[in-house]
């Protein structure tokens, strides 16, 4: 299933992650999928 609104898939972590985390961890792979 696709990730819910406000989250993005992380291949590194193998789960959906909150886009809000990108403020703290901007280089995380899933941040590329966050608007």
């Amino acid at each position: 299933a696709p990730c819910s609104r406000g989250s993005s898939w992380s291949a590194d972590l193998d789960k959906c992650m909150d886009c809000a985390s990108c403020r703290a961890r901007p280089h995380s792979d899933f941040c590329l999928g966050c608007a």
Epitope: D12, L13, M17, D18, A20, S21, R23, A24, R25, H27
Partner: antibody, heavy 119, light 111 residues
Framework: EVKLEESGGGLVQPGGSMKLSCVAS????????MSWVRQSPEKGLEWLAE??????????HYAESVKGKFTISRDDSKSRLYLQMNNLRAENTGIYYC??????????WGQGTTLTVSS | DIVLTQSPASLTVSLGQRATISCRAS??????????MQWYQQRPGQPPKLLIK???NLDSGVPARFSGSGSGTDFTLNIHPVEEEDAATYYC?????????FGGGTKLEIK
């Protein structure tokens, strides 16, 4: 199963030093920010110190109340977190929790270790 | 430092009813997109457990009867329907800036 296990607590006299340790398992330790949080009846939950990742040059941050007195460190090869505490006072008494978070929240908590500062 | 004020300090809720806990921050902890507020549950003799991150996002494995809302300075944790196992103390925590701070806690009792 995620596990964080603290050790090193106990009774110490005012002015003394203590080093707490925490061993982690069940998650990718080297990809998590790690912190120490203290709980006491007087002050509730208090964040004390944080250490980030190797890619952040192991950046550390401290609460003003422990700056210059406590030192947080980590050993990723052993999945261990440490807190060196110097010049301890009665107000440093409490339960010390080792915590881990992917970012700016606390995903994982240990059971805590109790430190008592008293003569 | 940002001060988080929780209310009420304690509340008693009947089984199956709604529990509402508030957390007010001394300054905004939100951007236009996200709010940097977490909620934790602490049962007696246990460490805190993450329930909700970024104001509204349920942590994995947390029952859907828990929900979070709010932005800016005012945040709310709702539990509905309340179950016996929800008897605990609940804390809010901001991550807007360092130092991270926690609210003083709200003790929930179930009748």
């Amino acid at each position: 199963e995620v596990k964080l296990e603290e050790s090193g607590g106990g009774l110490v006299q005012p002015g003394g030093s203590m080093k707490l340790s925490c061993v982690a398992s069940g998650f990718t330790f080297n990809n998590y920010w790690m912190s120490w949080v203290r709980q006491s009846p007087e002050k509730g939950l208090e964040w004390l110190a944080e250490i980030r990742l190797k890619s952040d040059n192991y950046a550390t941050h401290y609460a003003e109340s422990v700056k210059g007195k406590f030192t947080i460190s980590r050993d990723d090869s052993k999945s261990r977190l440490y807190l060196q505490m110097n010049n301890l006072r009665a107000e440093n008494t409490g339960i010390y929790y080792c915590t881990g978070g992917f970012a700016d929240y606390f995903d994982y908590w240990g059971q805590g270790t109790t430190l008592t500062v008293s003569s | 430092d940002i001060v988080l004020t929780q209310s009420p300090a304690s509340l008693t809720v009947s089984l199956g009813q709604r529990a509402t806990i508030s957390c007010r921050a001394s300054q905004s902890v939100s951007t236009s997109s996200y709010s940097y507020m977490q909620w934790y549950q602490q049962r007696p003799g246990q460490p805190p457990k993450l329930l909700i991150k970024y104001a509204t996002n349920l942590d994995s494995g947390v029952p859907a009867r828990f929900s979070g809302s709010g932005s800016g300075t005012d945040f709310t944790l709702n539990i509905h329907p309340v179950e016996e196992e929800d008897a605990a103390t609940y804390y809010c925590q901001h991550s807007w800036e360092i130092p991270y701070t926690f609210g003083g806690g709200t003790k929930l009792e179930i009748k």
